[in-house]
């Protein structure tokens, strides 16, 4: 029912942190901000390769290098995160491979999730050697600015020592940081001198200061957190799908449409039809019949199966996918051959009995 226009509008601001509605799960490449990333296009016999990010053509620039089947991103930033695709164009067909890039301080402050080296941060002092607090691992504190995509986990660390063992407390924007200040609260692991916030949201942006003190002194260190929201995009359809098909009269066939979308998408299968011998209505609008439509979470929304086809079923079939940001559509042709003539290069596909059409 949604409009069939080839013009997409993508200027709209995001609403909530998007859920992924990916029918096919692409590989995920993770890099920390500032790192370089190299990805090889995993397609065979690639004569010409083109690259896209979030459905938009990707060309070389001062940070993006495209050499043959390799994509290099230098000095990655969270804004490089997204859905990438390389398409290999061949003489007879094309193939697309999708992958995700996630540039993130998923566990910030240069640390891994398990804190396996945490023990070395917990320094035991001789009880007679009184000492004001001091930092034990400044390398883990060098990076003060942390830009993290929404919904990720952030960890700030202030490994310290002192005698007696110092205590640690955290401030947000210079004020005491309380559990009720954020949905889901936060965790403090004193033995690892860390503050952990899960599933960060834009309201978590700000300055976080660890204050480490004992009776002989006090030290502090401030981190700045920026939560980067990845803008949802209009749906992206896998190149080459749906694929052209042919079958004999009475045969069965299916078309498949693979979708990548941040916001919840809706799939429609559409065909140009004639009514009363005309392709256009009295209102001048073409007769585009919606054969099937449903949300992506419905079973087999991405598959259109046609059973016992007739010559009237021949023609163009359009897979149209829309979300609140925009839409995308791709089409394929069905050729219906006389009973005695076998299908050509595009072999008949037998449909599973699960499908409705």
């Amino acid at each position: 029912r949604p409009s069939f226009s080839l013009v997409e509008d993508t200027t709209l601001e995001p609403e909530e942190p998007p859920t992924k509605y990916q029918i096919s799960q692409p590989e995920v490449y993770v890099a920390a901000p500032g790192e370089s990333l190299e990805v090889r296009c995993l397609l065979k016999d690639a004569a010409v390769i083109s690259w896209t990010k979030d459905g938009v053509h990707l060309g070389p620039n001062n940070r993006t290098v495209l050499i043959g089947e390799y994509l290099q991103i230098k000095g990655a930033t969270p804004r490089d995160s997204g859905l990438y695709a390389c398409t290999a164009s061949r003489t007879v067909d094309s193939e697309t491979w999708y992958f995700m890039v996630n540039v993130t301080d998923a566990i910030s402050s240069g640390d891994d999730e398990d804190d396996t080296d945490g023990a070395e941060d917990f320094v035991s002092e001789n009880s007679n050697n009184k000492r004001a607090p001091y930092w034990t691992n400044t390398e883990k504190m060098e990076k003060r600015l942390h830009a993290v995509p929404a919904a990720n986990t952030v960890k700030f660390r202030c490994p310290a020592g002192g005698n007696p063992m110092p205590t640690m407390r955290w401030l947000k924007n210079g004020k005491e940081f309380k559990q009720e200040h954020r949905i889901g609260g936060y965790k403090v692991r004193n033995q690892h001198w860390s503050l952990i916030m899960e599933s960060v949201v834009p309201s978590d942006k700000g300055n976080y200061t660890c204050v480490v003190e004992n009776e002989y002194g006090s030290i502090n260190h401030t981190y700045h957190l920026d939560v980067v929201e990845r803008s949802p995009h209009r749906p992206i359809l896998q190149a080459g799908l749906p694929a052209n098909a042919s079958t004999v009269v009475g045969g069965d066939v299916e078309f498949v449409c693979k979708v990548y979308s941040d916001a919840q998408p809706h799939i429609q299968w559409i065909k140009h039809v004639e009514k009363n011998g005309s392709k256009y209505g009295p209102d001048g609008l073409p007769y585009l019949k919606v054969l099937k439509h449903s949300g992506i979470n419905s079973s087999n929304a991405e598959v259109l199966a046609l059973f016992n086809v007739t010559e009237a079923d021949a023609g163009e079939y359009i897979c149209k996918v829309s979300n609140y940001i925009g839409q995308a559509n791709q089409s394929a042709w069905l050729t219906v051959l006389p009973k005695q003539q076998a299908p050509g290069r595009e072999k008949e596909i037998t449909a599973s009995p699960d499908y409705l059409e």
């Epitope: 409009s3 609008l285 609140y324 409705l356």
Partner: antibody, heavy 120, light 107 residues
């Protein structure tokens, strides 16, 4: 002439279920979709979902996915909507509305409505 | 979900006047907007679809316009039988949504 004849008013108890019907005539039933729309307080309209009258495929508004179930009986050109676990918030007039299935067209013909009152 | 906002809940007009009822979509809905009229005690009936196409049998004093996010239903030479509630409806993106309605009354 397109006609959609809905079943009569229903008075049901909280927690119960109700099944209302919509019988279509005057057009090729199997070429269309039947939508259901809720109207509360005589004002706001909410789309519940639709059903393909040929193969029975359904699409629901997420808000009503656990509330409504749409079914079709092609032999009698009748569409049904079952509402379950009813509460006072479900008290409303429910309309069946035809859509001819053409992309540029909107829903065009409405039934007379079925009033559902949920009360103990 | 796309929100359709009809900012005027009530509009007063005089017979023979021209009145414009507006509707704003929270996101681009192209021209996939319909307008429905609902008279007291009756079911809604279709006036306009595809933003500006009059449904069969609708008088030509009803005109629809707009695209993208801003839409208008204009009634020229208002008649007494036009006093009703008017709803805009977007069918560009699922779930389908409706505006809150505008009641047209005589001054």
């Amino acid at each position: 002439e397109v006609q959609l004849q809905q079943s009569g008013p229903e008075l049901v108890k909280p927690g119960a279920s109700v099944k209302i019907s919509c019988k279509a005539s005057g057009y090729t039933f199997s070429d269309s979709y039947m939508n259901w729309v809720k109207q509360s307080h005589g004002k706001s309209l909410e789309w519940i979902g639709d059903i393909n009258c040929n193969h029975g495929g359904t699409s629901y508004n997420q808000k009503f996915r656990d509330k409504a179930t749409l079914t079709v009986d092609k032999s009698s050109s009748t569409v049904y909507m079952e509402l379950r676990s009813l509460s006072s918030e479900d008290s409303a007039v429910y309309y069946c509305v035809r859509w001819d299935g053409f992309l540029y067209h909107s829903m065009d013909s409405w039934g007379q409505g079925t009033s559902v009152t949920v009360s103990s | 979900d796309i929100v359709m906002t009809q900012s005027h809940k009530l509009m007063s007009t005089s017979l023979g006047d021209r009145v414009s009822i507006t509707c704003k979509a929270s996101h681009n809905v192209d021209t996939a907007v319909a307008w429905y009229q609902q008279k007291p005690g009756q079911s809604p009936s279709l006036l306009i679809y595809w933003a500006s196409t009059r449904h069969t049998g609708v008088p030509d004093r009803f005109t629809g316009s707009g695209s993208g996010t801003d839409f208008t239903l204009t009634i020229n030479n208002v008649q007494s039988e036009d006093l009703a509630d008017y709803f805009c409806h977007q069918y560009n993106t699922y779930p389908l949504t409706f505006g809150g309605g505008t009641k047209l009354e005589i001054k």
